[in-house]
């Protein structure tokens, strides 16, 4: 392990396709890759009228814009779909919305995704 | 280095099966998820199957649904398609290829190919 | 399922020009964007994934943008080997699809 880095081993796994993709919903995805990769965990959600929707979480391979970020922290302003990515176990249990842009309200998690 | 093999292709007649392989090398095939791709002859490239690096999820195209089965066998590094009901819209070259995880398809190794003709 | 709309189909360039290629999604994806260069006869190749991350041993001429539905192939300076059918695909929901392909031609 480099000095200073978190090293991902496994993330939050969501799928809300999880029937039409035949997976689970929930549950810890162990992350693989080359060794010479680096490995993060995501999270994908939707802000439908004030209400949080997950999309997907899960592992996400060698990003540079994952790089060193302990927090799941979307930066983007307003986007359609929100995305954010970590390094660390687990990271992507918590996420959150801070455009860089203007000051707003985060949105806080973890969430309880809806039942099918 | 990695390398992924494919074989099993060939001439088979309308409502037959095939079964393809992709032998896999060089490097740990029970860490990726692993999927199949297809192209007919002077066309673009269509998804057909995924699987996790477990076998625990697999998920399909519509277009192939009931019809094919994707599988693999860890200890044999080996990953399968078994093809029932073949039409001729199935003719296509096949192509296995590997992804880390199950949402981050990225396909970042794939085999030669393998030539699948349906026709009687 | 969501569409991949490539542009343009085909295009003629010369070795050292600036080449390109978008591909558009028919909703976001988020940065679920990934490139692909095929050859005749030949498997695709991976270019960029993640929109914009350089795979493996890819020369750095190639580069990829763009986020939401609307996304970029750049290739700096073409070279005579990077004449081939270039492929978009996203991975943000399944089926996966790919774009058409643009073919990339000597003029």
């Known amino acids: 392990a480099i000095l200073g880095r978190s090293e991902t081993q496994e993330c939050l796994f969501f799928n809300a396709n999880w029937e039409k993709d035949r997976t689970n919903q929930t549950g810890v995805e162990p992350c693989y890759g080359d060794k010479d990769k680096r490995r993060h965990c995501f999270a994908t959600w939707k802000n439908i009228s004030g209400s949080i929707e997950i999309v997907k979480q899960g592992c996400w391979l060698d990003d540079i814009n994952c790089y060193d970020r302990t927090d799941c922290v979307e930066k983007k302003d307003s986007p359609e779909v929100y995305f954010c990515c970590c390094e660390g176990n687990m990271c992507n249990e918590k996420f959150s919305y801070f455009p860089e842009m203007e000051v707003t309200q985060p949105t806080s998690n973890p969430v309880t995704p809806k039942p099918p | 280095e990695v390398q992924l093999l494919e074989s099993g292709g060939g001439l088979v007649q309308p409502g037959g099966s095939l079964r393809l392989s992709c032998a896999a090398s060089g490097f740990t095939f029970s860490s990726y998820s692993m999927n199949w791709v297809r192209q007919a002859p002077g066309k673009g490239l269509e998804w057909v199957a995924s699987?996790?690096?477990?076998?625990?999820?697999?998920s399909y195209a519509d277009s192939v649904k009931g019809r094919f089965t994707i599988s693999r066998d860890n200890s044999k590094n080996t990953l399968y398609l078994q093809m029932n009901s073949l039409r001729a819209e199935d003719t296509a070259v096949y192509y296995c290829?590997?992804?880390?995880?199950?949402?981050?398809?990225?396909?970042?190794?794939w085999g030669q190919g393998t030539l699948v003709t349906v026709s009687s | 399922d969501i569409q991949m709309t490539q542009s343009p189909s085909s295009l003629s360039a010369s070795v050292g020009d600036r080449v390109t290629i978008t591909c558009r999604a028919s909703q976001s994806i988020v940065s679920y964007l990934n490139w692909y260069q095929q050859k005749p006869g030949k498997a695709p190749k991976l270019l960029i994934y993640a929109a914009t991350s350089l795979h493996s041993g890819v020369p750095s001429r190639f580069s990829g943008s763009g986020s939401g539905t609307d996304f970029t192939l750049t290739i700096s300076s073409l070279q005579p080997e990077d004449f081939a059918t270039y492929y978009c695909q996203q991975s943000y929901d399944t089926p996966l699809t790919f774009g058409g392909g643009t073919k990339v031609e000597i003029k």
């Open positions: 290829a590997r992804s880390a995880n199950w949402h981050d398809t990225h396909l970042d190794y």
């Open positions: 699987i996790n690096y477990n076998s625990g999820y697999t």
